[in-house]
């Protein structure tokens, strides 16, 4: 905190302008009126104040608005936003997407900080759901944003918002998150034709059930190995050799390179060896001919 000292003669700020960058901290404290600062916040971001000077300006705003800043001030915070704590931000009511964009712009190039996470949380809660425009904005600044949400939070994403999602936005999502997003994507893209549908749904397939993979295998989609390797193991296991061959098309040859990795490894263990041999890839580890396969999971379900 800066101690109170009288403003030197002739230094009282009449407006927020460039001359203030040469003011020492105590001079800013003494010579800049908080109400003037609040009404001219739009100028603050256009003046390269040092972080120490920004501390003083923040202190002035905190005194003026102890219950939290109004949005008219928040939208012009600029670099001053980097000085805010999550506790400060929890007092705000941010409703404008433009305000959100302005603050995210300031943080561009930095990791998603606790401040940004709190800001986004306040904004989304205020809107009630993660609408398309908000999702568009957030994923533009933070491609991994979607995957930072819990499955519970993702459940509030309306299917219409899925159109804003790019493949790279899902790179860090785990299967539980894709389980939530996949049905939404399926609903969002349901009116598209086969090949277009596959292009859009591909990134979400880590959440697809067996029956949907079986359906895709009938559509000549030629799934690449990278996508196949991200599928749920429990969804891949029931697929027959013929279905996997149809699903992968020319990419089926890639199975050999992945035969020791999940889900390929586990899938091989469930197939008859003579079925695997029909692929001509030299895949080993299938069920030898003449062995009887008991589906114990089915038996348990019946008992």
């Amino acid at each position: 905190e800066v101690e109170k000292t009288a403003c030197p003669s002739g230094k009282k700020a009449r407006e927020i302008d460039e001359s203030l960058i040469f003011y020492k901290k105590w001079e800013l404290e003494a010579c800049v009126d908080a109400a003037l600062l609040a009404t001219q916040m739009d100028r603050v971001n256009a003046i390269p104040f040092t972080y120490e000077q920004l501390d003083v300006l923040k202190h002035k705003l905190d005194e003026l608005y102890p219950q939290g800043y109004p949005e008219s001030v928040i939208q012009h915070l600029g670099y001053l936003f980097l000085k805010m704590s999550p506790e400060d931000i929890r007092k705000w009511n941010v409703t404008s997407l433009e305000t959100l964009k302005a603050l995210l712009e300031v943080n561009k190039g930095h990791e998603m900080s606790p401040q940004v996470a709190t800001l986004i949380d306040r904004f989304v809660k205020g809107r009630g759901q993660l609408d398309k425009d908000t999702l568009d904005t957030l994923t533009a600044f933070y491609p991994g944003y979607l995957c930072s949400l819990s499955p519970e939070e993702l459940s509030s994403v309306p299917p219409s918002s899925i159109w804003a999602v790019r493949p790279q936005d899902l790179d860090t999502c785990d299967p539980r998150q894709l389980d939530v997003l996949y049905p939404k994507a399926r609903l969002a893209f349901q009116n598209m034709n086969g090949s277009e549908y596959f292009v859009k749904i591909q990134s979400f397939l880590g959440g697809a059930p067996t029956e949907d993979l079986k359906a895709l295998s009938q559509q000549n989609v030629s799934m690449d190995l990278a996508t196949f390797m991200k599928l749920r193991t429990d969804a891949v296991l029931p697929l027959t050799v013929a279905e996997v061959q149809k699903l992968l098309g020319p990419h089926v040859e890639g199975l050999k390179a992945e035969e020791r990795h999940r889900p390929v490894r586990d899938w091989i263990l469930r197939q008859r060896q003579d079925d695997l041999d029909t692929l001509g890839l030299g895949l080993q580890g299938g069920i030898p001919n003449g062995y009887l396969v008991l589906d114990l999971s089915m038996q348990e379900a019946l008992s």
């Epitope: 460039e18 960058i21 040469f22 020492k24 901290k25 256009a46 003046i47 390269p48 104040f49 040092t50 972080y51 120490e52 000077q53 920004l54 670099y79 980097l82 190039g109």
Partner: antibody, heavy 117, light 107 residues
Framework: QLQLQESGPGLVKPSETLSLTCAVS????????WTWIRQSPGKAMEWMGY???????NYNPSLESRATFSVDTSKNQISLKLNSVTAADTAVYYC???????????WGPGTLVTVSS | DIVMTQTPSSLSASVGDRVTITCRAS??????LAWFQQKPGKAPKPLIY???SLQSGVPSKFSGSGSGTDFTLTISNLQPEDFATYIC?????????FGQGTRLEIK
Amino acid sequence: QLQLQESGPGLVKPSETLSLTCAVSGGSISPYYWTWIRQSPGKAMEWMGYIHYSGRTNYNPSLESRATFSVDTSKNQISLKLNSVTAADTAVYYCTKVGDPGLFDYWGPGTLVTVSS
Amino acid sequence: DIVMTQTPSSLSASVGDRVTITCRASQGISNYLAWFQQKPGKAPKPLIYAASSLQSGVPSKFSGSGSGTDFTLTISNLQPEDFATYICQQYSSYPITFGQGTRLEIK
């Protein structure tokens, strides 16, 4: 990737005006602040001041009002004029982009200006 | 103005060594200190900001520490490409000022 390139005469006579431009490519000069920094032989670098893309400026008081920065958004360049030069103004002049307050994240390669008759 | 003083002004070391360069501010600057690497005829390259935070893409062999008036830059496992001049800069208050540089030479 943003690139900055300073240009101007390498030799200026004492008492004349030194003029340099900095061309910015790979991105817009908006909405950033830009600065000129110079490095005289055997001395510490000197921050000369800022110019905002809108044309607002701040100068280091040590330059005693001899410096003028300007910006041309249509050409995506900033300029420096330093009048009444002396041998003490001999330096490598750099233009830089301001990232976070007080930090310079992109630099031009610099251009050497010698003040001599 | 805040005066930044670097020590030593030059330093000889061998490949594989670990070296430390010091920067002292004439008054407290909190952690508002940056370090640059500069090679002859080239623009300075930002290494560290906020006294100890590495700029993206800068290897972890570079580390910074300090607060207030005394700061250090440490370079471990020196490689031929690390021999250059290192410069500190304060951005606590205007005018922004720089150290005179420490030249790191191969022994």
